[in-house]
């Protein structure tokens, strides 16, 4: 999703870490919307 | 030219913080991450972390997690890392880097000196 | 932690002579591409780094060709054919293959 980014090389070396951090974070943030959806 | 200019020389006291800016030209600032190393005095150079300023995706060394913040203001093509908590140990030059698509610091700012001191 | 070990840690010299300086990793650098991201970094007296050479031997802009880089594995060596002196200084070397990316201690080179 970062056409531009792509010729940096640091894009290359965390590309796969950068992933595992976002779907980290939306499964932590989709925990939490569960968690406030339970206590409503 | 690609040209990366830092914020001044700052001292502050234990248990503060402190926020160094990184303003970034002559290229397109969303082309490219934004790292941070520091330097301490008769240390090596140490790779605190790395922002990705089109979604502001962070990546940090697990060494300041939690101590170190990351951050971008694309309208101002300027970076800056804020370290809180800060120790004698945090005194240390801090460098903000940009790298290419072949090596990743190859431009680096002048340097910011944060000493911690009581 | 990839530990880079930087020899020796002080390397005294005569100008036009050559320099070499050997950096060895903790384990090997090779990406899972297979490329080895092995980096020189020079730091002169009150400057920031300047990077040098990329991806073990590839020299960056502006770099004159009396610095060259070589190794493989976990063995680096950077060699300077004829120490001129603006190349006094600490030189650097980094690894980007493996996360934490780290910096050898360094190797400061210096008027025999």
């Known amino acids: 999703d970062n056409p531009s980014l792509s010729i940096d090389l640091t894009f290359h070396l965390l590309r796969t870490l950068l992933e595992l951090a976002r779907t980290q974070s939306q499964r932590e943030r989709a925990e939490q919307n569960r968690i406030i959806f339970d206590s409503v | 030219q690609v040209q990366l200019v830092q914020s001044g020389a700052e001292v502050k006291k234990p248990g503060a913080s402190v926020k160094v800016s990184c303003k970034a030209s002559g290229y397109t600032f969303t082309d490219y991450f934004m790292k941070w190393v520091r330097q301490a005095p008769g240390q090596r150079l140490e790779w605190m972390g790395v922002i990705n300023p089109n979604n502001a995706d962070i990546f940090y060394n697990q060494k300041f997690k939690g101590r170190v913040t990351i951050t971008r203001d694309t309208s101002a093509s300027t970076a800056y890392m804020e370290l809180s908590s800060l120790r004698s140990e945090d005194t240390a030059v801090y460098y903000c880097?940009?790298?290419?698509?072949?090596?990743?610091?190859?431009?680096w700012g002048q340097g910011t000196l944060v000493t911690v001191s009581s | 932690d990839v530990v880079m070990t930087q020899s020796p840690l002080s390397l005294p010299v005569t100008l036009g002579q050559p320099a070499s300086i050997s950096c060895r990793s903790g384990q090997s650098i090779v990406h899972s591409d297979g490329n080895t991201y092995l980096e020189w970094y020079q730091q002169r007296p009150g400057q920031s780094p300047r990077l040098l050479i990329y991806k073990v031997s590839n020299r960056f802009s502006g770099v004159p060709d009396r610095f060259s880089g070589s190794g493989s594995g976990t063995d680096f060596t950077l060699k300077i054919s004829r120490v001129e002196a603006e190349d006094l200084g600490v030189y650097y070397c980094f690894q980007g293959s493996h996360i934490p990316w780290t910096f050898g201690g360094g190797t400061k080179v210096e008027i025999k």
């Open positions: 880097a940009r790298g290419t698509d072949r090596a990743l610091f190859a431009y």
